[in-house]
């Protein structure tokens, strides 16, 4: 089900991430450090529990979840959000809600790459990962 995502991934390109973070409402200082970070993403599956760990000089974060079940998350930029992740057409689609706001993060496979699309209102950031 999520096996195509399993493994260790390194960020190789990032487009429009600062504008996305601005739209989310992330402050300048946090945007600067987060934008400079080159995270590794480690995805593992244990039964119906999926774990996504992000490691960088900026912040290490980890979420463990079951598909379709809402969970609490503290994001790398320090938002306290309610998240739900579902599988949609082979993509992991995450919706984060906080302070009356909502953003969608879609993780999908594209050839040998893992592409992460972050959408907030009309602003989209695309971040591409390759296997480490």
């Amino acid at each position: 089900m999520c096996d195509a995502f399993v493994g260790t991934w390194k960020l190789v390109s990032s487009e429009n991430f600062d504008d996305y973070m601005k739209e989310v409402g992330v402050g300048f200082a946090t945007r600067k450090v987060a934008g400079m970070a080159k995270p590794n993403m480690i995805i593992s599956v244990n039964g119906d529990l999926v774990t996504i760990r992000s490691e960088s000089t900026f912040k290490n974060t980890e979420i463990s979840f079951k598909l379709g079940v809402e969970f609490d998350e503290i994001t790398a930029d320090d938002r306290k959000v309610k998240s739900i992740i579902t599988l949609d057409g082979g993509a992991l689609v995450q919706v984060q809600k906080w302070d009356g706001k909502s953003t969608t993060i879609k993780r999908k496979r594209d050839g040998d790459k893992l592409v992460v699309e972050c959408v907030m209102k009309g602003v989209t950031s695309t971040r591409v990962y390759e296997r480490a």
Epitope: G25, F28, F58
Partner: antibody, heavy 119, light 108 residues
């Protein structure tokens, strides 16, 4: 509980340099940026810059670029700000504060170090 | 740089009176990044309201914050003696981070 400890006062001569310290405790030092703020007697607050202990990345207000150098020692959970070529205009209270991510507000403040530049 | 203009610069209020302090921002910012601090003489500033409307820990519920874009305000529903202080607004959306010049609130 989160604490930022700063020396109470420093007296230095014009033209000299001084290194102000800010020792953090009660949280994971590398998880939050440390920012520095200047307040002249009877005046408002000015942001000098900040440093992210996890990466060592710094951002300085252009106004203080040639005046202030920010560093950290993660082994002692201490942030430092070196001020150079001191003049009477540098006499002020200097605060360090912890930056809370996302909102980027200063959620915990040190007591401030009163710097007096005088011959 | 983004300039924050606070008004009034100085005001006095009687106990029980409603108080409103405004902060006008020279260019639009995210409401998540507008904050207020309280400072009493000879002490460090304290975080008071963050993200426009969130009260910092320990702040009495008579305080509230509102606004968006370029116009923000801090309101005290009923002035108390302990509220006498200087209040600063601050923006964290744009480089460099900037503060307003402060509003000194005195007890009448």
């Amino acid at each position: 509980q989160v604490q930022l400890q700063q020396p109470g006062a420093e007296l230095v001569k014009p033209g000299a340099s001084v290194k102000l310290s800010c020792k953090a405790s009660g949280y994971t030092f590398t998880s939050n940026a440390i920012t520095w703020v200047k307040q002249r007697p009877g005046q408002g607050l000015e942001w000098i810059g900040d440093i992210s202990p996890g990466s060592g990345s710094t951002t300085n207000n252009e106004k203080f670029k040639s005046k202030a150098t920010l560093t950290v020692d993660t082994s002692s959970s201490t942030a430092y700000m070196q001020l150079s070529s001191l003049t009477s205009e540098d006499s002020a209270v200097y605060y360090c504060a912890r930056l809370r991510g996302y909102y980027d507000y200063f959620d915990f403040w040190g007591q401030g170090t009163t710097l007096t530049v005088s011959s | 740089e983004v300039v924050l203009t606070q008004s009034p610069a100085l005001m006095a209020a009687s106990p029980g009176e409603k108080v409103t302090i405004t902060c006008s921002v020279s260019s639009s910012i995210s409401s998540s990044n507008l904050h207020w601090y309280q400072q009493k003489s000879e002490t460090s500033p304290k975080p008071w309201i963050y993200g426009t409307s969130n009260l910092a820990s320990g702040v009495p519920v008579r305080f509230s914050g509102s606004g968006s874009g370029t116009s923000y305000s801090l309101t005290i529903s009923s002035m108390e003696a302990e509220d006498a202080a200087t209040y600063y607004c601050q923006q964290a959306s744009h480089y460099p981070l900037t503060f307003g010049a402060g509003t000194k609130l005195e007890l009448k």
